[in-house]
């Protein structure tokens, strides 16, 4: 039986040309956690698996930096980075715990950030 | 260059024990995950076991867990792979792996007979 | 866990010729997928990560690419030293699989 939750930034917005972190935590389980996959939509971004550490797809590597953590990190942001993305534990033996958060690059300088939201 | 060299295969009894060593040269050991991956008679490939960069975590499957053991001295550019209680179906070629896979040993011979 | 299905254990191809070997896996994977050469008597290498970019050193007639859950190594121009084992794996998900090889020889 799957008993854990994902905590996730939830809808959160940054400015054009900033940056963001994303992040997720796992909690209320004692599974291991093998690989963290984030996504965008049908894109897959990265992956940091818990021995062979951090791989960044070449497609996303000048935006994308890997941590703080298991968390990830957009740079130069622009308005066609608004959208949904996932956060995918990977665990043994629970299997996969999924996280949401939406972002939205906003071309002002009033981006605020969102509050924290559970998915379970 | 990057080089891994495997050794410490051989012919094994059912029920034994083996310990395979690989050395590695040419780039940060420190700095990188490593694996084993065995390549059984028939050419399949398998993961065998994973180990972080610092050892403090490692990964193995269902069908070596509690007898395969995998361990690193970074001090000394060596990955390990101690092996027990092993079977006929262990019966492979060993190969040691660099990170996401970019570098590979020539690999160890491991054979499980009576 | 995934399974990555190369549904031809052997193709037959000509020097010149261009040949695309596949694999399917058994649920999306996106583009985590690597695909590697073995010659006779050696280890296998890596010839292309992230479903479609070549490692260091590697020709530029190897492409890969991706079609939802069906993976693609194409050789543009089969040269005599490509005659050999070719295996995709998947790293969306632990544990890593492998498909079960395709070997490529002359006709």
């Known amino acids: 039986m799957m008993t854990g939750t994902i905590e996730t930034t939830g809808n959160i917005s940054a400015e054009k040309g900033g940056s963001i972190i994303l992040q997720c935590h796992l909690s209320s389980t004692t599974a291991q956690v093998t690989q963290v996959n984030w996504e965008q939509q049908d894109q897959l971004l990265a992956i940091c698996n818990a021995d062979l550490g951090w791989h960044i797809s070449p497609s996303f590597k000048d935006r994308v930096a890997p941590g703080p953590g298991l968390g990830l990190t957009l740079q130069s942001l622009t308005v066609n980075d608004t959208g949904e993305y996932f956060c995918i534990y990977h665990t043994y033996p629970d299997g996969t715990y999924t996280g949401r958060i939406f972002l939205e690059v906003l071309e002002s300088s009033v981006a605020e950030h969102g509050a924290r939201f559970q998915i379970p | 260059e990057v080089q891994l060299v495997e050794s410490g295969g051989g012919l094994v009894q059912p029920g034994g024990s083996l310990k395979l060593s690989c050395a590695a040269s040419g780039f940060t050991f420190s700095s990188y995950g490593m694996s084993w991956v065995r390549q059984t008679p028939d050419k399949r490939l398998e993961l065998v076991a994973t180990?972080?960069?610092?050892?403090?975590?490692?990964n193995l499957p269902d069908s070596v867990k509690g007898r395969f053991t995998i361990s690193r001295d970074n001090a000394k550019n060596t990955l390990h792979l101690q092996m027990s209680s092993l079977k006929s179906e262990d019966t492979a070629m060993y190969y040691c792996?660099?990170?996401?896979?970019?570098?590979w040993g020539q690999g160890t011979s491991v054979t499980v007979s009576s | 866990d995934i399974v990555m299905t190369q549904s031809h254990k052997f193709m037959s191809t000509s020097v010149g010729d261009r040949v695309s070997i596949t694999c399917k896996a058994s649920?999306?994977?996106?583009?985590?997928v690597a695909w590697y050469q073995q010659k006779p008597g050696q280890s296998p290498k890596l010839l292309i990560y992230?479903?479609?970019t070549r490692h260091t050193g590697v020709p530029d007639r190897f492409t890969g690419s991706r079609s939802l859950t069906d993976h693609t190594l194409t050789i543009s121009s089969v040269q005599a030293e490509d005659l050999a084992l070719y295996y995709c794996?998947?790293?969306?998900?632990?544990?890593?699989?492998f498909g079960g090889g395709t070997k490529l020889e002359l006709k």
């Open positions: 794996q998947q790293y969306y998900s632990t544990p890593y699989t």
């Open positions: 792996v660099r990170g996401y896979f970019d570098y």
């Open positions: 649920q999306d994977v996106k583009t985590a």
């Open positions: 180990i972080k960069s610092d050892g403090g975590s490692t």
């Open positions: 992230w479903s479609s």
